[in-house]
Interface confidence: low
């Protein structure tokens, strides 16, 4: 027989010869990093037809690294489902926790022993420092010094010293996020007050009030013979300006060769029209608003035209 077969997990005991006699036996041992588990044979014999009898290295098993427990509030995931040397261990933390240490450890061979490349990481609870304080406002849980994952705080504005209230600009609720950062910037509290919107040759059909604060919404209708140039609905924005701008009511021109559409009591159907959002503040009117036949709005005797909650 010629030289005996070579294997990944076991090696020949002694030096190989150029050829072997029929009936001659060779023995193998497990390579470094592998260990023998009986009963499979680790030897072979030169057969009379000049071939080696079948043998495999299935009896030699890779050394494995020590078992790693799941970190508290996390998981240790063997990359290939095995702890054998040459493979990796991945660490993941549960939601609301973050990893301190190496995310991946390698099972390495040191001498004939398989050991991990480092110390297993730990999973620490996601914590946020207190959210920012805001001028003219406060948030809930202001006495708490440390916030946990998904803890929420809600901002509100202080009572204003003057006649006009502070309005909350932005989202009132923020959450402690998974990277220990609050979910968004804190809102601001400031006085937002828009000028009384005057539309000549037209009238308000909703949003009656003496003062117009943040998000106050006003809707207009033009008098008979006039049409609306602009949006029928305007909203008081955070800069104390109307958005879109206050519309105009323009006179319907007498018909020429082409007839314009009938625009009596018309309301713009512009696609930019904002959905009417009820004013968040502002005193209720003490006077009777003008009667409107605008479709979808009740007459005054049927109830107030808009909710100014």
């Amino acid at each position: 027989c010629e030289e005996p077969p070579t294997f990944e997990a076991m090696e020949l005991i002694g030096k190989p010869k150029p050829y072997y006699e029929i009936g001659e036996r060779v023995d193998y041992k497990c390579k470094k990093g592998y260990f023998y588990i009986p009963p499979l044979a680790t030897h072979t014999i030169c057969d009379r037809n000049h071939t080696w009898l079948p043998v495999s290295d299935d009896a030699c098993y890779r050394e494995t690294c020590p078992y790693i427990r799941d970190p508290l509030n996390g998981q240790a995931v063997p990359a290939n489902g095995t702890y054998e040397f040459g493979y990796q261990m991945h660490f993941i933390c549960n939601e609301g926790y973050y990893l301190i240490g190496e995310e991946i450890l390698y099972c390495e061979l040191k001498g004939s022993v398989a050991i991990w490349s480092g110390k297993p990481p730990i999973c620490e609870k996601v914590l946020c420092t207190p959210p920012p304080k805001i001028k003219n406002g406060k948030h809930t849980f202001s006495e708490v010094e440390v916030f946990e994952y998904l803890d929420a705080v809600t901002y509100s504005c202080d009572p204003a010293p003057g006649p006009d209230p502070f309005s909350l600009i932005g989202e009132s609720t923020i959450y402690c996020g998974d990277n220990s950062v609050w979910s968004r910037a804190a809102p601001e509290c400031k006085v937002v007050k828009c000028r009384f919107p005057v539309v000549e040759n037209g009238k308000q059909i909703s949003g009656f009030g003496k003062k117009f604060y943040y998000k106050a919404t006003v809707m207009f209708e033009c008098d008979k013979g006039f049409y609306l140039d602009g949006s029928d609905t305007i909203v008081c924005d955070s800069n104390s300006t109307w958005d879109p701008p206050v519309p105009k009511c323009l006179k319907v021109l007498p018909p020429s060769s082409t007839k314009p559409p009938a625009l009596s009591h018309s309301v713009s159907t512009s696609s930019t029209t904002k959905s009417p959002a009820s004013s968040a503040s502002g005193p209720r009117p003490t006077y009777k608003p003008p009667v409107s036949n605008y479709p979808g709005y009740p007459k005054p005797e049927e109830g107030i035209l808009d909710s100014l909650d």
């Epitope: 609301g96 609870k125 998904l150 609720t173």
Partner: antibody, heavy 116, light 109 residues
Framework: QVQLVQSGGGVVQPGRSLRLACAAS????????MHWVRQAPGKGLEWVAV????????YYADSVKGRFTISRDNSKNTLYLQMNSLRAEDTAVYYC?????????WGRGTLVTVSS | QSVLTQPPSVSGAPGQRVTISCTGS?????????VHWYQQLPGTAPKLLIY???NRPSGVPDRFSGSKSGTSASLAITGLQAEDEADYYC?????????FGGGTKLTVL
């Protein structure tokens, strides 16, 4: 695997009591606010109650106030809903859910039928 | 009667874009509280689809998007697929109470 496992549903007569449980596996519920949400057959979702992560704050829907009690045992990683003076209109699938302003993990639900 | 109003049903053909509206008031959505969206496939528990008005949890395709303006919000689904057929619920908050819309049944034609 992170999941909420519910138990305790069944058929009960009007005026009687029932306790639902929601056990968390793969996560520690003592870090989270927990809610109960219900869904009557063929209807939409209705929020029932919430308890803060430490159990100190509880809120209830008006429809169950004074009859239902939400509680938690953080050592057992379990949320409870004690339902007393049950009415026919309490018949629903009850879900437990985790989260603060929103519910990012739900149990599979347990059916409560109130019938004589 | 739900405090948040949704259309009872919407439909669209595969590949199309559909939107579902959710209308609240100045005491919930209009007061600055976030809007969240849930998908409920037949016979299963609801699943978070959009949180904080326009954020997607991991695993939710970018075909789903949310927006909020004033007292209302909407969910848009582009490139409609057969597996999107489900009930969709919007949700928000008002003083000590979590709110849900009445739900919208999406049918993929």
């Amino acid at each position: 695997q992170v999941q909420l496992v519910q138990s305790g549903g069944g058929v009960v007569q009007p005026g009687r009591s029932l306790r639902l449980a929601c056990a968390a596996s793969g996560l520690t519920v003592n870090n989270y606010a927990m809610h109960w949400v219900r869904q009557a057959p063929g209807k939409g979702l209705e929020w029932v109650a919430v308890i803060s992560y430490d159990g100190n704050n509880k809120y209830y829907a008006d429809s169950v106030k004074g009859r239902f009690t939400i509680s938690r045992d953080n050592s057992k990683n379990t949320l409870y809903l004690q339902m007393n003076s049950l009415r026919a209109e309490d018949t629903a699938v009850y879900y437990c859910a985790k989260g603060g302003g929103y519910f990012d993990l739900w149990g599979r639900g347990t059916l409560v039928t109130v019938s004589s | 009667q739900s405090v948040l109003t949704q259309p009872p049903s919407v439909s669209g053909a595969p590949g199309q874009r559909v939107t579902i509206s959710c209308t609240g008031s100045s005491s919930n959505i209009g007061a600055g509280y976030d809007v969240h969206w849930y998908q409920q496939l037949p016979g299963t528990a609801p699943k978070l689809l959009i949180y904080g008005n326009n954020n997607r949890p991991s695993g939710v395709p970018d075909r789903f998007s949310g927006s909020k303006s004033g007292t209302s919000a909407s969910l848009a689904i582009t490139g409609l697929q057969a597996e999107d057929e489900a009930d969709y619920y919007c949700s928000s908050y008002t003083s000590g109470t979590w709110l849900f819309g009445g739900g919208t049944k999406l049918t993929v034609l």
